[in-house]
């Protein structure tokens, strides 16, 4: 209430002979500062002086003398809010009632306070969670109610003896409300720790021992086993007999079942600590273990492997990868339950030994077609041989091999025959699908791998196919070889260069583009009739009657073909000249008289010239002389002349009579 | 019966490029399954494998020359020529050609040239 | 690249001797090892191969054995002729390699 002081402080202060102690307070006076302390052990209060009596250890006045035997205690207070105090050293016998006598200008107060001082250091005090599981972190609490700033102490943590790994935190507490010193230690119990003995030590600066509190620890924790196995390598053959003992080496609380896992899963009827196996089998391979369960839980024993030794079973191939393709490369794995691994493998490919192959893996790094077919393999181990298994395929796939081009016709093929070719491989893989052809024609196709050429062209050479599956493979082109007539036979005259004249020597060249078969023969004609038969006709001194319409003829065993008609045009001056006269070489006079130059010659003739019997040119100069009216004086010989570009040509002389009219007789 | 011979330079300088060719009879490379390996032995050394060619014209190299190793076949003139460029006296050696079957792999060599001794030295 | 290693490098045996020559293969090679007999101033001739297989004209003396990484070439009773220099290869992986060979004297 109001009439009240209000002090703060620790209701008890505990500390050992010779150690300090330390009291933090605080007060709030009722009325101003405070003006007189004592601080007495032990008060009790006499009613006849109406005051206290007892032990002063401290006294402070007005006059603010304090006694000498009280430096042992010091008011570390002030006069309105603070009444801290500290005593160093402090003896047993400072053990019971403190008294803070507080007076003021008008009111006065006693607060008590208790001290436990013990002959020897207190011990601390651990302080455990109620239950303690293994591997689950707990916090371990060493609690000390002390502290005091002229006393320096620590507090350790051992566990059998022996200082503890983990960090402990430590703090401290001097406060109105407490004075204590705690250390905190985490800690993560494991089930070996069970039944051990935890201790926290107090020491002082030095590290001295002062006291001690000890805990054992009781960590809960699932059974903890040993598996023996006889044979101690749990290594057998099939048909041995196995034995497995399951012993607890730990179980807190005590365990309640027992059951046998294989390869975890649990065994049915097996629920003592021994297993036994007899005749075992290899599906009796694999790892065990014990399992015995408490109230934490379940605890699992090591696992046992047990290996049940045997022959190797039959094989299978495994082929990387099938189809291949030729040139690639190929992996074949051969499988097969054995125990211990086999050793040696023996491979076969379609029943056949492959030599130097005795890995568990055959690498071929280049497939070949004849690599097609079955892959077998035997393994081995130290108990046995295996048994050949039933093999796996291998698929070499790879364009179509060897192909021809074949001609079905009888040879030799002929101008215009029709022609069949197919075209033929020895082996494909997968099947051939199509074929092509080179070069490419308006051809037709009748059945696969079958080409026709009707009228074979005389310049079908070479024919080359393909055989297709997933590739093309093309064969060597062939010939076909055609043969035909001699074409494109001409005449070619190879001399004179110029025109041919007459007397000149001439060469004609019977000339053809090709021929097959190149064996010929030649025949020269004029007008039906055979000349010769080379290659070319020779003139030695061509005549205007050799001029005319020659062909030439190129045979050889397929047929013969001409050439086309060649005119032969020889260049000569006027020849065989002769006058003729109309209506005849004799005229009457008063007629009409005609005399023509006739000619042969070639070119025609350019230009006539008559002359008279006495060799005088006459001014005429075409092919004919019209005499009109022919008169008697115009009687006698005549001869013409012809001229071309090649020369000149004379006539014989032609007498021309002109007789008189019966009407001149009949005057005369 | 089949037979293969080595011809080439009896002496190169070095820098020089070596080229050496080996003849063979009673084999053809085109036939599949087949190959022919460069394989060289300096004086009082081992063997050391070079190259190899195989019945498609296929070919390998050892890892430490391959820059400098050149391998083909002439099948029409049944012949197999290895180049080495960039010669150095540490390859004086005696090269050999043989012949290797090719089954489910690499076989053994069978058949080998009598060898022809290559000095390189200026 | 597989590593042979042989060893002996060289030994001195009497005639009548039986002679045992190791090589190793620095990673398992199956049974692709192959032995071969070189004389002085001849070509290698292959003596074994794929580990045991003996050829037809090579004297039945000569034998192999082994598998994986560990081969032996064994001479059952040593003959004069028989003095050279022995190397193993291995076809099992390109590039080829051959051992250092092992060399052989007659005492």
């Known amino acids: 209430d109001s009439s009240k002081w209000v002090f703060e402080h620790p209701e008890t202060l505990y500390a050992w002979e010779g150690a300090c102690v330390w009291i933090p307070c605080t007060y709030r006076a009722l009325d101003g500062d405070l003006e007189s302390f004592i601080l007495f052990h032990n008060p009790e209060y006499n009613k006849n002086t109406s005051k206290f009596d007892g032990t002063r250890l401290y006294e402070s006045t007005k006059d603010g003398k304090v006694p000498s035997e009280q430096k042992r205690v010091q008011f570390l207070g002030d006069k309105n809010k603070n009444c801290t105090l500290s005593i160093h050293p402090v003896h047993l016998n400072d053990s019971g009632q403190l008294g803070l006598r507080m007076e003021s200008k008008t009111e006065k107060w006693m607060e008590r306070i208790h001290l436990n001082v013990s002959e020897r250091p207190f011990p601390p005090h651990i302080q455990l969670p109620p239950e303690i599981q293994e591997s689950q972190e707990v916090t371990l609490t060493c609690l000390l109610n002390f502290s005091c700033y002229g006393y320096p102490i620590q507090l350790q943590w051992l566990l059998e003896g022996v200082p503890m790994r983990q960090a402990a935190v430590t703090s401290t507490s001097l406060t109105i409300k407490s004075v204590f010193t705690r250390s905190e230690l985490k800690f993560s119990p494991q089930w070996s720790h069970h039944g051990k003995i935890v201790t926290c030590q107090l020491q002082d600066a030095d590290g001295k021992f002062l006291s001690n509190d000890t805990v054992q620890l009781n960590v809960k924790h699932t059974p903890k086993l040993e598996i023996k196995v006889t044979p101690s390598d749990a290594i057998v053959r099939e048909g041995d007999s196995v034995t497995m003992t399951c012993e607890v080496s730990s179980s807190n609380p005590e365990y309640t079942t027992v059951s046998w896992l294989k390869d975890g899963t649990s065994l049915k009827k097996q629920n003592t600590f021994t297993l036994n196996l007899r005749e075992v089998t290899k599906d009796q391979s694999g790892k065990y273990c014990c399992q015995v369960s408490n109230d934490v839980g379940p605890g699992r024993s090591e696992e046992v492997f047990l290996q049940v030794q045997y022959a190797p079973e039959p094989s299978t191939v495994q082929i990387l990868h099938s189809p291949a393709v030729e040139g690639s490369q190929v992996e074949f794995l051969c499988m097969s339950l054995a125990n211990p691994l086999p050793t040696n493998y023996t491979w076969y490919h379609n029943g056949k030994e492959m030599q130097g192959r005795t890995e568990e893996k055959v690498h071929i790094p280049k497939i070949l077609p004849w690599h097609a077919g079955t892959y077998s393999c035997v393994a081995e181990n130290i108990l046995g041989t295996g048994q050949r298994g039933p093999g796996a395929e291998l698929d070499v796939q790879y364009p179509p091999k060897k192909v021809t081009t074949v001609i079905q016709n009888p040879m030799p093929i002929r101008e215009g025959d029709t022609v069949t070719l197919s075209c033929n491989y020895n082996s494909s893989n997968p099947s051939v699908t199509r074929y092509e052809w080179k070069p490419h024609g308006a051809w037709e196709e009748p059945s696969l791998g079958v080409l026709k050429i009707q009228n074979v062209g005389w310049d079908n050479t070479t024919i080359a196919c393909a055989a297709c599956n997933s590739w093309c493979s093309w064969a060597s082109p062939v010939a076909l070889n055609v043969q035909y007539a001699p074409r494109d036979v001409r005449v070619r005259k190879i001399k004179p260069l110029s025109e041919i004249h007459s007397g000149n020597s001439v060469s004609l060249q019977c000339d053809f583009s090709s021929s097959h078969p190149k064996e010929v023969q030649f025949f020269w004609e004029k007008n039906g009739r055979l000349l010769g038969k080379e290659s070319q006709l020779n003139f030695d001194s061509i005549s205007p009657e050799d001029a005319g319409s020659y062909s030439c003829w190129v045979n050889n065993s397929i047929g013969q073909t001409a050439s086309k008609a060649w005119t032969l045009e020889v260049l000569y001056a006027p020849r065989r000249l002769r006058v003729s006269m109309s209506p005849g070489d004799q005229v009457m006079e008063g007629k009409s008289a005609t005399l023509t130059c006739e000619s042969d010659a070639n070119p025609p003739v350019s230009h006539y010239t008559w002359f008279d019997w006495n060799n005088q040119s006459l001014p005429y100069h075409s092919q004919k002389l019209r005499l009109e009216p022919v008169k008697v004086q115009h009687s006698g010989a005549y001869w013409c002349q012809g001229t071309n570009s090649v020369g000149k040509g004379r006539s014989p002389l032609s007498t021309l009579t002109v007789y008189y009219s019966p009407e001149t007789i009949g005057r005369r | 019966q089949v037979t293969l011979r080595e011809s080439g330079p009896a002496l190169v300088k070095p820098t020089q490029t070596l080229t050496l060719t080996c003849t063979f009879s009673?084999?053809?490379?085109?036939?599949?399954?087949?190959?022919v390996s460069w394989i060289r032995q300096p004086p009082g050394k081992a063997l050391e494998w070079l190259a190899l060619?195989?019945?498609?014209?296929?070919?390998y190299y050892s890892t430490s020359l391959k820059t400098r190793l050149t391998i083909s076949k002439d099948t029409s003139k049944n012949q197999v020529v290895l180049t080495m460029a960039s010669m150095d006296p540490v390859d004086t050696a005696t090269y050999y050609c043989?012949?290797?079957?090719?089954?489910?792999?690499?076989?053994?060599?069978?058949?080998w040239g009598q060898g022809t001794m290559v000095t390189v030295s200026s | 690249e597989i590593v042979l290693t042989q060893t002996p490098s060289s030994l001195s045996a009497s005639l009548g001797d039986r002679v045992t020559i190791s090589c190793r293969a620095s990673?398992?090679?199956?049974?692709?090892l192959h032995w071969y007999q070189q004389k002085p101033d001849q070509s290698p001739k292959l003596l074994i191969k794929?580990?045991?297989q003996s050829l037809s004209g090579v004297p039945s003396r000569f034998s192999g054995s082994g598998s994986g990484t560990d081969f032996t070439l064994t001479i059952n009773s040593l003959e004069a002729e028989d003095a050279a220099t022995y190397y193993c290869?291995?076809?099992?992986?390109?590039?080829?390699?051959f051992g250092p060979g092992t060399k052989v004297d007659i005492n």
């Open positions: 290869h291995q076809s099992r992986s390109l590039p080829f390699t």
């Open positions: 060619i195989d019945w498609d014209g296929d070919n």
């Open positions: 009673g084999i053809s490379l085109t036939t599949s399954g087949m190959c």
């Open positions: 043989a012949r290797m079957g090719y089954t489910y792999g690499y076989d053994a060599f069978d058949i």
């Open positions: 794929f580990a045991s």
């Open positions: 990673q398992s090679i199956g049974s692709l």
